[in-house]
């Protein structure tokens, strides 16, 4: 089973950006994290990015005021991924 983040939190929220913070997992099998942003109630991410396994902070920019966003971080290993850790925030 691919380890899942448990301490994802929001920091530095503005009307157009949201900062994410988490503790990078201590496992040599993890190759990175995928960050996805979905407007709540919509289908596919309006934003996706990949960061290295050592990264524990990310700022999502270009968001629109007054929209609820479901923001997920997924742990990636070779050949698999974790369940998403998801938080919802309105800008």
């Amino acid at each position: 089973e691919v380890p899942q983040l448990t301490d994802l939190s929001f920091v530095d929220i503005t009307d157009s950006s949201i900062g994410l913070r988490w503790t990078p997992l201590n496992s040599s099998t993890i190759i990175g994290y995928r960050i996805t942003v979905v407007a709540a109630g919509e289908g596919i991410p309006i934003f996706e990015d990949f960061v290295d396994s050592s990264v524990g902070y990310y700022t999502v920019t270009g968001l629109e005021p007054g929209i609820d966003y479901d923001i997920s971080v997924i742990t990636l290993i070779n050949g698999g991924e974790s369940a998403p850790t998801t938080l919802t925030q309105q800008t």
Partner: antibody, heavy 116, light 112 residues
Framework: QVQLVESGGGLVQPGGSLRLSCAAS????????MHWVRQAPGKGLEWVSV????????YYADSVKGRFTISRDNSKNTLYLQMNSLRAEDTAVYYC?????????WGQGTLVTVSS | DIALTQPASVSGSPGQSITISCTGT?????????VSWYQQHPGKAPKLMIY???KRPSGVSNRFSGSKSGNTASLTISGLQAEDEADYYC???????????FGGGTKLTVLG
């Protein structure tokens, strides 16, 4: 300016195949999900398929599942729709559209006619 | 799966206001959260008019507004103008069926 241009439509026999392309310009194509939407002559809009910016998320309408394949080449700023086992009911104008919150940019469409 | 139901046609006179409804029904009782609205003139590509229930893209007249109550979304056009005559479609994400869905479309006729 932001633009989507579809191509690849035409006349094809039932059971045949066709590949549609959608060339994007004026924006960072690799940052956006993309849709295919079709409209049969005199009918309403029907969503066909979507692919997320990285290709990690792909969904299809039930009516095309198993026959159509959506893909993208971010290095070429191009979206594709591979259509196999075509049926008469697939006859339509096919539009590509950019995914934001809502489908905010549309191409002019390309006509696909399936007939013997 | 969700089906979005719109009236086939509505009409109004120049200067009047009209409202087009979009009702979501689902076999499992589920609904939809957000909705977008599109305008399509004959022979043209659709144009996004409203997204996320009530938000207007830049460049769209403030005569167009959106709202939602329960499983029914509405598009209201105030101060009707001749160029508003077109087909209008609502669209939503069906989280149960994992697909996007369009309503059947509403033909708006501006009288006179």
């Amino acid at each position: 300016q932001v633009q989507l241009v579809e191509s690849g439509g035409g006349l094809v026999q039932p059971g045949g195949s066709l590949r549609l392309s959608c060339a994007a310009s004026g924006f960072t194509f690799s940052s956006y999900g993309m849709h295919w939407v079709r409209q049969a002559p005199g009918k309403g809009l029907e969503w066909v398929s979507v692919i997320s910016s990285s290709g990690s998320y792909i969904y299809y309408a039930d009516s095309v599942k198993g026959r159509f394949t959506i893909s993208r080449d971010n290095s070429k700023n191009t979206l594709y729709l591979q259509m196999n086992s075509l049926r008469a009911e697939d006859t339509a104008v096919y539009y590509c559209a950019r995914n934001k919150v809502g489908f905010d940019v549309w191409g002019q469409g390309t006509l696909v006619t399936v007939s013997s | 799966d969700i089906a979005l139901t719109q009236p086939a046609s509505v009409s109004g006179s120049p200067g009047q206001s009209i409202t087009i409804s979009c009702t979501g029904t689902s076999s499992d009782g589920g609904g939809y959260n957000t909705v977008s609205w599109y305008q399509q003139h004959p022979g043209k590509a659709p144009k996004l008019m409203i997204y996320y229930v009530h938000k207007r893209p830049s460049g769209v007249s403030n005569r167009f507004s959106g709202s939602k109550s329960g499983n029914t979304a509405s598009l209201t056009i105030s101060g009707l103008q001749a160029e508003d005559e077109a087909d209008y479609y609502c669209q939503a994400w069906d989280n149960q069926g994992m697909k996007y869905v369009f309503g059947g479309g509403t033909k708006l006729t501006v009288l006179g």
